[in-house]
């Protein structure tokens, strides 16, 4: 019997300082570019090596960015979201949602001889 996949969702405030080459990540999503079904949110698709986000270490690929400097990212066109980041200034505060996959064991009793997979 297969285990059920659940997700542990946490939120975090991440303060980044724009580096010489910027913030150092890519995004997908927006009302005109839905990356996740029925969700027009903005997601991190790439963390650039040695960029500001990578050096900070907290932002991860797959994170959903909820707001930038207190401005909500809901219902934005993709390019408008990109422009918001580009114009966010030197000190950038991101409210992000991490979604950690949690593998639960099989439902029901596991006997002594069963593998612990």
């Amino acid at each position: 019997m297969n285990g059920r996949v659940d997700y542990l969702v946490t939120e975090e405030e991440i303060n980044l300082t724009r580096g010489p080459s910027g913030l150092g990540f890519n995004i997908v999503g927006g009302t005109d570019q839905q990356y996740v079904s029925n969700d027009s949110g903005i997601y991190v698709s790439r963390i650039k090596e040695n960029g500001a986000a990578a050096l900070d270490g907290r932002l991860q690929e797959g994170d959903k960015i909820l707001s930038v400097n207190g401005q909500d990212l809901k219902n934005l066109l993709h390019q408008d979201a990109v422009d918001l980041f580009r114009n966010a200034g030197y000190a950038v505060s991101l409210r992000v949602q991490h979604r950690l996959q949690v593998q639960n064991g099989p439902i029901g009793h596991r006997g002594e001889g069963d593998p612990s997979g």
């Epitope: 910027g22 913030l23 990540f25 890519n26 995004i27 997908v28 990356y35 790439r46 650039k48 580009r86």
Partner: nanobody, 126 residues
């Protein structure tokens, strides 16, 4: 991981045309930022053209002759090359990255891209 496969290269006379294709794996192709680079023997890899969510970019040497486009339904990017010159002879390589950079985009910078194809040879004879 994203796989990129180029096709459409060949031998063509100066003044002729070719259309290159780059087919990508992945269900989110429409979100990819994509580019064409080229490399001639003994030369550095050179930017040719790029296509993002918001627009297209071209090297000065190909502007007005080459057109980059994409068909998201077919997971394919194209490079239509017209008025070909002998100096266009090179291996043409497709590059991609998922999403749009939140920083200023430098289409000609190879570090903007994570995935690269093997290339397709284009030879223009005089």
């Amino acid at each position: 991981d994203v796989q990129l496969v180029e096709s459409g290269g060949g031998l063509v006379q100066a003044g002729g045309s070719l259309r290159l294709s780059c087919t990508a794996s992945g269900r989110t192709f429409s979100t990819y930022t994509m580019a064409w680079f080229r490399q001639a023997p003994g030369k550095e890899r050179e930017f040719v053209a790029a296509i993002t969510w918001s627009g297209t970019y071209y090297a000065d040497s190909v502007k007005g002759r080459f057109t980059i486009s994409r068909d998201n339904a077919k997971n394919t990017m194209y490079l239509q090359m017209n008025s070909l010159k002998p100096e266009d002879t090179a291996v043409y390589i497709c590059a991609a990255v998922i999403g749009s950079t939140v920083d200023s985009y430098s289409p000609s910078d190879p570090l903007e891209y994570d995935y690269w194809g093997q290339g397709t040879q284009v030879t223009v004879s005089s």
